[in-house]
């Protein structure tokens, strides 16, 4: 009789362990679903807000024609500035025309005043040629005014309404550029 009771007790304990496991699995599953739901809601929220505010440029970016510009609030060396822009899906500013240069310098005057801002221009160490980061040559009117006396790599920056050159390892603010979103209307 005692043996029978202890067998039943063991079976009941086993059942209880299985139920606890099942409950644990269910709780985990429920938590996972809740997380997925949260993620989906966040994703939908983002998609909806982008659909509603389908503004051509992200918040805190300035628009001019087909471009969006971001003026940094931190200093960094030229290469790090480039990487910071890439993280935002943009590149360092590439000035294509006098009109664009005027827009940038005018905007900087309004925002911050006379500081140095890296742009996507660097000097080839061998040939001494200035090239934009995409490999294209600047138009003649958009070449840095002074040749830097640096033995290190030389990069371009904007200050006031001038394009100048400096050792790429110096710390400056920077300007990122990306294409503005085209309106689907």
């Amino acid at each position: 009789k005692l043996l029978q009771v202890s067998t039943i007790a063991m079976q009941q304990q086993e059942k209880l362990i299985q139920q606890e496991r099942a409950l644990l699995n269910f709780t985990e599953w429920k938590r996972s679903c809740a997380l997925q739901m949260k993620y989906c809601q966040a994703f939908m929220q983002n998609s909806l807000s982008s659909a509603h505010n389908s503004s051509p440029c992200p918040n805190n970016w300035i628009q001019n024609r087909e471009s969006c510009y971001y003026v940094s609030e931190i200093w960094s060396i030229w290469h790090t500035s480039q990487e910071n822009c890439l993280k935002e899906g943009s590149t360092l500013l590439q000035i294509e025309s006098k009109e664009e240069m005027d827009f940038i310098t005018g905007s900087l005057r309004k925002i911050k005043g006379s500081y140095d801002y890296w742009v996507g221009l660097s000097q080839d160490g061998h040939s001494g040629r200035w090239l934009w980061q995409d490999g294209s040559s600047p138009s003649p009117g958009l070449l840095p005014a002074e040749r830097s006396q640096s033995a290190n790599q030389v990069c371009g920056y904007v200050k006031s309404n001038s394009l100048l050159s400096s050792n790429c390892s110096t710390w400056k603010y920077f300007i990122c550029e990306k294409y503005a979103l085209r309106s689907s209307v």
Epitope: E83, K87, E88, G89, S90, T91, E177, K178, Y179
Partner: nanobody, 115 residues
Framework: QVQLQESGGGLVQPGGSLRLSCAAS????????MGWYRQAPGNQRELVAA???????VYGDSVKGRFTISRDSAGNTVHLQMDSLRPEDTGVYYC?????????WGQGTQVTVSS
């Protein structure tokens, strides 16, 4: 979590060409730009080329005019066409995905330019 898989490395003669590919999987919606870096023995990793989601491109000074970066229409594979290769292009080429938060690196693929 973004995973990156590089392919296309190998041994090539000076003046030759190679095409590297990098396929991204995982959280690809968070990727804003993708690029290639290289590291020669004893040197730091340097940016070779990068491309943003919008198609803007960036090249390292030493490869301008010789290398071309592009991405497929789906946007999750990036290609690096390397022409007029030189011995100094030898190194391990790493793919990198840029996001607002973390950046992700591939395992690297060896490129050797030698006669």
């Amino acid at each position: 979590q973004v995973q990156l898989q590089e392919s296309g490395g190998g041994l090539v003669q000076p003046g030759g060409s190679l095409r590297l590919s990098c396929a991204a999987s995982g959280g690809i919606s968070s990727i804003n730009s993708m690029g290639w870096y290289r590291q020669a023995p004893g040197n730091q990793r340097e940016l070779v080329a990068a491309i943003t989601n919008g198609g803007r491109t960036v090249y390292g000074d030493s490869v301008k005019g010789r290398f071309t970066i592009s991405r497929d229409s789906a946007g999750n594979t990036v290609h690096l066409q390397m022409d007029s290769l030189r011995p100094e292009d030898t190194g391990v080429y790493y793919c990198k995905a840029f996001t607002r938060g973390d950046d992700y690196w591939g395992q690297g693929t060896q490129v050797t330019v030698s006669s």
